[in-house]
Amino acid sequence: AGVFELQIHSFGPGPGPGAPRSPCSARLPCRLFFRVCLKPGLSEEAAESPCALGAALSARGPVYTEQPGAPAPDLPLPDGLLQVPFRDAWPGTFSFIIETWREELGDQIGGPAWSLLARVAGRRRLAAGGPWARDIQRAGAWELRFSYRARCEPPAVGTACTRLCRPRSAPSRCGPGLRPCAPLEDECEAPLVCRAGCSPEHGFCEQPGECRCLEGWTGPLCTVPVSTSSCLSPRGPSSATTGCLVPGPGPCDGNPCANGGSCSETPRSFECTCPRGFYGLRCEVSGVTCADGPCFNGGLCVGGADPDSAYICHCPPGFQGSNCEKRVDRCSLQPCRNGGLCLDLGHALRCRCRAGFAGPRCEHDLDDCAGRACANGGTCVEGGGAHRCSCALGFGGRDCRERADPCAARPCAHGGRCYAHFSGLVCACAPGYMGARCEFPVHPDGASALPAAPPGLRPGDPQRYL
């Protein structure tokens, strides 16, 4: 665990011609605030959710009123750092989006109006525990100067915040196999061992022996997906005991989407589908041009040269939404075989296989007969993730351990009586019938209807079926 810290140094007009208009005026005083969004990996496409590493919002900056005739200066900034805590290991490579927002403080009906001034994005490598890294990014005519770092929260240390340090039990040295913690040489590295069986994909631990679940997973080992199928309403906080979502107020109640956006519920919150020209969490952002970089995930921005003309994002395959911010549901093609559950992780599809199947797409039928013997000469038959014994004559049951009654199925026709025999069964036929199962009537003239009785056997004698 640790914290990503962002320090904004300045936000103002960039060098060169075409200085931007001041965002505030005497008639419309305003103040700035910033939002940072972090994603793991060097590729934005690898993000499992919009801000999978976390996001943070700054405080509001001082109120600013433009001085008539003066060029737009660096704008007054909020105090303090933006801090994004992360629970798991620091990934080492990450993508960031930093947005500069303007809050207008005029006499708007319904409170202050927000609009996006600039957005910058980048991909960086960064080791936790290192010094502050400085950066300058430009968005249109604006320039943002900032510094950032990742630091581990005690007792975690290391470039990924995955090693734990504990005070030494002995003054001279650490225990067997444990190294001193640099730079805390008076502390020792402690192995972090989660509870046995804790899911490496959906669980994590901050203390040895625990297993804490990522959102969407439950159970003692975080192996049970939170299900809404047996619940009345897919809303509200999850219950760790049932894996159900308890009814609560709906996130779309009252439609939080502005500017004609339509609201749809998601497992975690809500999602607005915005009309063209608007975007943001609640479709509240407008007046955006291609210079603001509104298209995510490598989308190509067309048009929108000035705030009065709408831009269009041409999304790369696999992305959609007015700003290419949404991933297409690839699981709808049902790529997982044999009843496997499909999970779209963004950078890849994963299949959670049913018992008895394995492989990336659950394509391998595990050898269910391995180590399972069928008794009394029976043979094992695989199928559907379970095993079945095909038993030798005279035996039955799951493992062919039960002696079968060959007469149970009443195999003797036309009222013949069945007798169990060591090699099968014997039918004693009623008068007028013959054959191994008494299936052939005997004609009055003494000739049988089908095969003749074998030599030495009279009609009516018991026929032994082998």
Partner: nanobody, 120 residues
């Protein structure tokens, strides 16, 4: 690298028919699942029809009885026969495939899309 190339899109009158085809090429060991999605202006991309990993055929409710998906395994090609077309079928149609590469890894690929316009 794998390429999906769609063809067969165009303009047609309501009630008319079109046949889309999508050919997969490249370092393909096998095709696990393959099908068609579509995206109408201002709408989300949705599955139209496909062959699942278990080789079952699936269809969106809105196209059942009108569209038929078929495949030619030897050519790594999937087809979408669209009949009784309606104005609401107007969209860009994308081919999609879940492919096992020679490395035995699985990757999901998209075509560039082909436009189908239904108007009187």
């Amino acid at each position: 690298e794998v390429q999906l190339v769609e063809s067969g899109g165009g303009e047609v009158q309501p009630g008319g028919s079109l046949r889309l085809s999508c050919a997969a090429s490249g370092s393909i060991f096998s095709i696990n699942a393959m099908g068609w999605y579509r995206q109408a202006p201002g709408k989300q991309r949705e599955l139209v029809a496909g062959f699942t990993g278990d080789t079952n055929t699936i269809y969106a409710e809105s196209v059942k009885g009108r569209f038929t998906i078929s495949r030619d395994n030897a050519k790594n090609t999937v087809y979408l026969q669209m009949s009784s077309l309606r104005a609401e079928d107007t969209a860009v149609y994308y081919c999609a495939a879940d492919v096992q590469l020679f490395s035995r890894d699985y990757e999901f690929y998209w075509g560039q899309g082909t436009l189908v316009t239904v108007k009187p």
